[in-house]
Amino acid sequence: EINGSANYEMFIFHNGGVQILCKYPDIVQQFKMQLLKGGQILCDLTKTKGSGNTVSIKSLKFCHSQLSNNSVSFFLYNLDHSHANYYFCNLSIFDPPPFKVTLTGGYLHIYESQLCCQLK
């Protein structure tokens, strides 16, 4: 298992929510990506392929997510101060072998300007 800080911008704020970007290498074909808040699994997404190369995408812990060819984005909404924490992208690579797990993360700071706007 490889542990480290994300060497890219992991948190993108918009409209009182945050997009948490979990990157993986382009060469990875099949994987599981989990978003951890501290030690708790918040979200996950698994991509596999069958014997006919058909793609299956599954989530056991569903969050709004977006898959690209080198990243999974998880979206958290209605931010408040309780969201401030360490978040980790836990990537399990199934294919290509060998099986490998990598953990990258960063601290989500919550500032007043990023909180969801309340109507006065």
């Epitope: 099949q30 596999t48 069958g50 014997s51 006919g52 190369n53 299956s56 294919d95 290509p96 072998p97």
Partner: antibody, heavy 117, light 111 residues
């Protein structure tokens, strides 16, 4: 140790039906796509069907589409193949196989299906 | 559907000698960095066994006398020094798209 044990084969008349089962153990069944592959006596391997981890995606060989149905019960760690409208050319050993991400990495011993009058 | 062909249909090789099996696909099996081509060994009375995946990567536990090569449409399985336990039928197989298909097999015997 991964184990796949097929059952349900036998002799059936043309036009008849059979349901094959495959009991899986030694791995997390719900994490893997599963397939059926058949082999007619003295002949080569022919892919029949596959199903994804949750049972929501299924694919079939043109030879069996519309006649065979693959399914799975993850609570029972069991794979199924319902075979209807059987023909003489469906006579074969039917293997249950695990699709191990990039190849069929585990196989059962097979169950023989004979379609004859 | 992609058609897989193999040559020769059978071959007999002396113990310790090299055996070479060829496989050809009717369209390229290369996608990105990967050739979606696998090789299986089937000994008499047994189910098949996965030997090689992605055209050239040995499955865990497979002896290093087995090697795979090739790209696109032309592939080769080589047994560098044939052993008695290698007597079997060898199949190539693609998983580039659905339906996946197997080659007709090549029977390897001892001369």
């Amino acid at each position: 140790e991964v184990q796949l044990v097929e059952s349900g084969g036998g002799l059936v008349q043309p036009g008849g039906s059979l349901r094959l089962s495959c009991a899986a153990s030694g791995f997390t069944f719900s994490d893997y796509w599963m397939d059926w592959v058949r082999q007619a006596p003295g002949k080569g391997l022919v892919w029949v069907s596959n199903i994804d981890e949750s049972g929501s995606i299924t694919e079939y060989s043109p030879f069996v589409k519309g006649r065979f149905t693959i399914s799975r019960d993850n609570a029972k760690n069991t794979l199924y193949l319902q075979m209807n409208s059987l023909r003489a050319e469906d006579t074969a050993v039917y293997y249950c196989t695990r699709w191990g991400r990039f190849g069929f990495d585990s196989w059962g011993q097979g169950t023989l299906v004979t379609v004859s009058s | 559907d992609i058609v897989m062909t193999q040559s020769p249909d059978s071959l007999a090789v002396s113990l310790g000698e090299r055996a070479t099996i060829n496989c050809k696909s009717s369209q390229s099996l290369l996608s990105g960095s990967f050739n979606y081509l696998t090789w299986y060994q089937q000994k008499p009375g047994q189910p098949p066994k996965l030997l090689i995946f992605y055209a050239s990567t040995r499955q865990t536990g497979v002896p290093d006398r087995f090697s795979g090569s090739g790209s696109g449409t032309d592939f080769t399985l080589t047994i560098s020094s044939l052993q008695a336990e290698d007597v079997a039928v060898y199949y190539c197989h693609h998983h580039y798209n659905a339906p996946p298909t197997f080659g007709p097999g090549t029977k390897v015997d001892i001369k």
